[in-house]
Interface confidence: medium
Amino acid sequence: CSCAPTHPQTAFCNSDLVIRAKFMGSPEIIETTLYQRYEIKMTKMLKGFDAVGNATGFRFAYTPAMESLCGYVHKSQNRSEEFLIAGRLRNGNLHITACSFLVPWHNLSPAQQKAFVKTYSAGCGVCTVFPCSAIPCKLESDSHCLWTDQILMGSEKGYQSDHFACLPRNPDLCTWQYLGVSMTRSLPLAKAEA
């Protein structure tokens, strides 16, 4: 299974549903499909109110039954740990894959947490995070923001991922906008505390 690097804003905008939830146990195989499902307990919905309609929550997250089919494998045994899940809606069910943006909520930077709750949505359908994976790369449109974390940081986790959103500056122009939370956590020379 191969996944393209994804900026959190892209994950938010390309998902039908973005929720906070806890995983309640081991997956259950669904016969006659390529799928299994995890029981989850949704704690907050961040995106998808329109798509969901009257549904009050999701009890299950569906995923391909094997890692080699891009199935998501939940490794944490901590049922009280809250995860951000950005997934797709299919026939009223939440679907995720190994490529889904799915991380412990507490692992997100404060800026990302704030952005998932309110800021990223302002860029959806208007602005595009354009990945720069090899030099040279250039903007193809004024509605694009060049995402250079992979080049500069050697990883999809970097300044722009952790602390910036691609938002409309005016109707015809999108730019990186700082999310307004301390940047010290991801300065390249900062050392993790033991």
Epitope: C1, C3, L89
Partner: antibody, heavy 121, light 110 residues
Framework: QVQLVQSGAEVKKPGESLKISCKGS????????IGWVRQMPGKGLEWMGI????????RYSPSFQGQVTISADKSISTAYLQWSSLKASDTAMYYC??????????????WGQGTLVTVSS | DIALTQPASVSGSPGQSITISCTGT?????????VSWYQQHPGKAPKLMIY???NRPSGVSNRFSGSKSGNTASLTISGLQAEDEADYYC??????????FGGGTKLTVL
């Protein structure tokens, strides 16, 4: 080069058993799913099932569950499709194909030449 | 149990452009940018022509292009040639593996 080579055409009688093969070469056979696809005369493509030769994990389409058995021998990079008791309605062309997977995408990027199975009394 | 609907036949003259449609639902074609197209000449194995809606594998002519609008994916062949005469199948992501292929479209070059 990268290819899938299938065994030759078979003519069988109803009730007989049969095992056809698909040998991969030129790539890491154990790292990709192999699917079997049926095409009855004059008809479209039907997904029968898939196997991951690395660990022989197998998934069947509900329409074919219990009708056929899919297996693989990774030591010789070969996948198999077999019947224990053929019926006239099994007459078809059978293709093996390599399945590519990423995120929600699944598509067959490499196909065998096909094995024609004819079942007639 | 075909989930994806294709026209049974399409025809065009050499040099023309033709488009083959593949209509699904918001749960398959509409929901994902993951539609693929296969070409099958009589008596031959299918060949992948387009994947992920609009990507061409290496070796496939740039006369073949794919697109998607809403719940309908399309395969367009420009500058039609005699050798394009074949059956064309679309395929989309689906949970139920028996539902992944369209019914097929026979392309006739007049």
């Amino acid at each position: 080069q990268v290819q899938l080579v299938q065994s030759g055409a078979e003519v069988k009688k109803p009730g007989e058993s049969l095992k056809i093969s698909c040998k991969g070469s030129g790539y890491s056979f154990t790292s990709y799913w192999i699917g079997w696809v049926r095409q009855m005369p004059g008809k479209g493509l039907e997904w029968m099932g898939i196997i991951y030769p690395g660990d022989s994990d197998t998934r069947y389409s509900p329409s074919f569950q219990g009708q056929v058995t899919i297996s693989a021998d990774k030591s010789i990079s070969t996948a198999y499709l077999q019947w224990s008791s053929l019926k006239a309605s099994d007459t078809a062309m059978y293709y093996c194909a390599r399945l590519r997977v990423h995120d929600y995408a699944m598509y067959f990027d490499l196909w065998g030449q096909g094995t024609l199975v004819t079942v007639s009394s | 149990d075909i989930a994806l609907t294709q026209p049974a036949s399409v025809s065009g003259s050499p040099g023309q452009s033709i488009t083959i449609s593949c209509t699904g639902t918001s749960s398959d074609v509409g929901g994902y940018n993951y539609v693929s197209w296969y070409q099958q000449h009589p008596g031959k194995a299918p060949k992948l022509m387009i994947y992920d809606v609009s990507n061409r594998p290496s070796g496939v002519s740039n006369r073949f292009s794919g697109s998607k609008s809403g719940n309908t994916a399309s395969l367009t062949i420009s500058g039609l040639q005699a050798e394009d005469e074949a059956d064309y199948y679309c395929q989309s992501y689906d949970i139920m593996p028996e539902r992944v292929f369209g019914g097929g479209t026979k392309l006739t070059v007049l």
